[in-house]
């Protein structure tokens, strides 16, 4: 009686169960009653990452430097190439098909998380007691100067964009 279902890592063809090709190999010919499935390795620029019956391997992803991409991890016969972005850029999507410049945090905002090749800068508003007076992709909110520790007094209150201005204490004669 011919099988209607096959074991894991097998496939049903011509009423018989044939072994799937292992990752890194493609199907060349189905098994016969005399021989196992004929599988052959993917070429240098190709891969297959699962047990399969594909007659063609997939082409490795190309990390196009014109799009700001560079190779993070070279592909093998079993894995695709992983791209990342050049310094100062990050991926526009999870599949990292193109790159855009990191955004800067505007005055009043500081860097919560510095950008990587795969994620953009994360900014946060400077809370009370902190400020940022620059547009930057690296600088965190800085604390207001403590006038007291310098034996000075606050002459001008700080904001989220400006530091406090300290001045000498009024001396009573």
């Amino acid at each position: 009686e011919p099988p209607t279902a096959c074991r894991e890592k097998q496939y049903l063809i011509n009423s018989q169960c044939c072994s799937l090709c292992q990752p890194g190999q493609k199907l060349v010919s189905d098994c016969t009653e005399f021989t196992e499935t004929e599988c052959l390795p993917c070429s240098e620029s190709e891969f297959l990452d699962t047990w399969n019956r594909e007659t063609r391997c997939h082409q490795h992803k190309y990390c196009d430097p014109n799009l700001g991409l560079q190779v993070q991890q070279k592909g093998t016969s079993e894995t695709d190439t992983i791209c990342t972005c050049e310094e100062g850029l990050h991926c526009t999507s999870e599949s990292c098909e193109s790159c855009v410049p990191h955004r800067s945090c505007l005055p009043g905002f500081g860097v919560k998380q510095i950008a990587t090749g795969v994620s953009d800068t994360i900014c946060e508003p400077c809370p009370v007691g902190f400020f940022s007076n620059v547009s930057s992709a690296f600088e965190k909110c800085r604390p207001w100067t403590s006038c007291e520790t310098k034996d000075l007094v606050v002459q001008q209150a700080g904001t989220n964009k400006t530091d406090v201005v300290c001045g000498p204490q009024d001396r009573q004669r």
Epitope: V28, E38, T55
Partner: antibody, heavy 117, light 111 residues
């Protein structure tokens, strides 16, 4: 029944052309690489050409066959072809079709091509 | 193209003899080496593939070994039905090039 059957052989004059056919039955033609192998009378086996499995038309030829011989297939007819042009006396042989690429698990019985004036 | 050199071209042997046929590839073919048996008026029959894997139904007296460029077919105890011609076949592949080559054949005749 799983089988291959060649046809189209015969007598042809030097410089002439011939198209061989190989009808496949009993297996999925589309997922199998197919090849042609020939054998001159009283001589050994000689690889001619192969065509890859799948829908893409990827072909491979022995260096001596390039330019004169063309392998092709019609998946809907489960038939393999070998178009032979500019035939010479030394092309006289039994032509076998075979299933596989790195090994040949299934062979037809062959068709004889005679090139003579 | 890949060139396969097979030896001897013929050998005389008796039933029960141990027979060895060798095959050398012009470049490394890893384990992509097959052996075929052919009898007069018939198509070749696959005996061994991937150097040492016996095709189903082939008697265990047939065995294959080797790797890279040097390969051997051994018949441990020759039987009457084994008198035939044997061919090795090598497969070579690079990224854009595929080649198959057959040895010249070894005719095994009765001593």
């Amino acid at each position: 029944e799983v089988q291959l059957e060649e046809s189209g052989g015969g007598l042809v004059q030097p410089g002439g052309s011939l198209r061989l056919s190989c009808a496949a039955s009993g297996f999925d033609f589309s997922t199998n690489a197919m090849c042609w192998v020939r054998q001159a009378p009283g001589k050994g086996l000689e690889w001619v050409a192969c065509i890859a499995a799948g829908s893409s038309i990827i072909t491979y030829y022995a260096s001596w066959a390039k330019g004169r011989f063309t392998i092709s297939k019609d998946t809907s007819k489960t038939t393999l072809y070998l178009q032979m042009n500019s035939l010479r006396a030394e092309d006289t042989a039994v032509y076998f079709c075979a299933r596989g690429l790195s090994r040949f698990a299934l062979w037809g019985q062959g068709t004889l091509v005679t090139v003579s004036s | 193209d890949i060139v396969m050199t097979q030896s001897p071209s013929s050998l005389s042997a008796s039933v029960g003899d141990r027979v060895t046929i060798t095959c050398q590839a012009s470049q490394s073919i890893s384990s992509y080496l097959s052996w075929y048996q052919q009898k007069p008026g018939q198509a070749p029959k696959l005996l061994i593939y991937l150097t040492s894997t016996l095709a189903s139904g082939v008697p265990s007296r047939f065995s294959g070994s080797g790797s890279g460029t040097d390969f051997t077919l051994t018949i441990s105890s020759l039987q009457p039905e084994d008198f035939a011609t044997y061919y090795c076949q090598g497969y070579y592949s690079s990224s854009s090039y595929v080649s198959n080559g057959f040895g010249q054949g070894t005719k095994v005749v009765i001593k």
